[in-house]
Interface confidence: low
């Protein structure tokens, strides 16, 4: 059973809360911290022992419209000699984020939140070896 | 993605861009995917640049729990299981969107917030600066 909406989670609901129609919530998409920048080490995607490439997916009915996905370049990892070592594995590291999806239905537009799984980069791991009896 | 063409008879009330404030359906698509990285894989232990996961919890945010990665070593783990300081463990960071209650404590009013999270670590060749 789903429990119906509750007045408030952790605190009493302030009197100043905006009215919201049932079944929906008010979302201000003016982003807090819009201009912060990722301060990752320079081009780690190329310097990593499990290097990766980036591709950008673009969807005008999604907010944000651009989502960047990483793909590991190799199955194995790059060793000190610059060669692929297939005794190790390059694996994707993933993170969930939220996007807002815009849906057109005739003359009306509706909005839906969606969880999206983003591949952020790759890391080199020791493989799990399954021994066959 | 596919842009659905607008019916030419629709009133021209919607801008090409997203409006600043929208009413959003309460149900989140794909909401129940696994959000605990400790359960989803053990890469954080098996990586040559292993990391620890720290729980960041904030009841005024959705999702209320976010896991932050912190690299265990400055160097990387070599084939012998020792830390090799000729290589560097570095965090992989990602900007993600979360919901922040605004005004605070209001049950159904949110604002998007961009936050920077360290998702895991990767082993890289260091940038060597030669001093003249």
């Amino acid at each position: 059973r789903k429990i119906p909406k509750v007045g408030h989670t952790f605190f009493q609901k302030p009197e100043s809360c905006p009215p919201v129609p049932g079944g929906s919530m008010k979302l201000d998409i003016g982003i807090i911290n819009e201009n912060q920048r990722v301060s990752m080490s320079r081009n780690i995607e190329s310097r990593s022992t499990s290097p990766w490439n980036y591709t950008v997916t673009w969807d005008p009915n999604r907010y944000p419209s651009e989502v960047v996905q990483a793909q590991c370049r190799n199955l194995g990892c790059i060793n000190a000699q610059g060669k692929e070592d297939i005794s190790m594995n390059s694996v994707p590291i993933q993170q969930e984020t939220l996007v807002v999806r815009r849906k057109h239905q005739g003359c009306s537009v509706s909005f839906q939140l969606e969880k999206v799984l983003v591949t952020v980069g790759c890391t080199c791991v020791t493989p799990v070896i399954h021994h066959v009896q | 993605g596919i842009t659905i063409p607008r019916n030419p008879g629709c009133p021209n009330s919607e801008d090409k861009n997203f409006p600043r404030t929208v009413m959003v359906n309460l149900n989140i698509h794909n909401r129940n995917t696994n959000t605990n990285p400790k359960r989803s894989s053990d890469y954080y232990n098996r990586s040559t640049s292993p990391w620890n996961l720290h729980r960041n919890e904030d009841p005024e945010r959705y999702p209320s729990v976010i896991w932050e990665a912190k690299c265990r070593h400055l160097g990387c783990i070599n084939a012998d299981g020792n830390v090799d300081y000729h290589m560097n463990s570095v965090p992989i960071q990602q900007e993600i969107l979360v919901l922040r209650r605004e005004p605070p404590h209001c049950p159904n009013s949110f604002r998007l917030e961009k936050i920077l999270v360290s998702v895991g670590c990767t082993c890289v060749t260091p940038i060597v600066h030669h001093v003249a």
Partner: nanobody
Framework: EVQLVESGGGLVQPGGSLRLSCAAS????????MYWVRQAPGKGLEWVAE????????YYVDSVKGRFTISRDNAKNSLYLQMNSLRAEDTAVYYC????????????WGQGTLVTVSS
């Protein structure tokens, strides 16, 4: 299958005490914040109290602060609500619930236990 079973409700006089229990099964109890929610006759649901996974933090609605205490025993997969100095306005069906609170839907809740405060 997730199950939450409340018990401990009953008829009590104003100023009296009751201890509600909730037996949880079918999920890793120690991994979730847990909640008590109540519904008075003819009224909407009201969130009452929350306790974090390890029991280190508790939150209460203002009307029960200082009178109700939420606690948990992770070894027994059990949630409790100690209710003291009960008032007529505390009369309600009390539910225990688990789940992420956005947008204020709980994943699962029990069948409830009725608390009646009356002289």
């Amino acid at each position: 299958e997730v199950q939450l079973v409340e018990s401990g409700g009953g008829l009590v006089q104003p100023g009296g005490s009751l201890r509600l229990s909730c037996a949880a099964s079918g999920f890793t109890f120690s991994s979730y914040s847990m909640y008590w929610v109540r519904q008075a006759p003819g009224k909407g649901l009201e969130w009452v109290a929350e306790i974090r996974q390890d029991g280190s933090e508790q939150y209460y609605v203002d009307s029960v602060k200082g009178r109700f205490t939420i606690s948990r025993d992770n070894a027994k997969n059990s949630l409790y609500l100690q209710m003291n100095s009960l008032r007529a306005e505390d009369t309600a069906v009390y539910y225990c619930a688990k789940g992420e609170i956005l947008p204020l839907y709980f994943d699962y809740w029990g069948q409830g236990t009725l608390v009646t405060v009356s002289s």
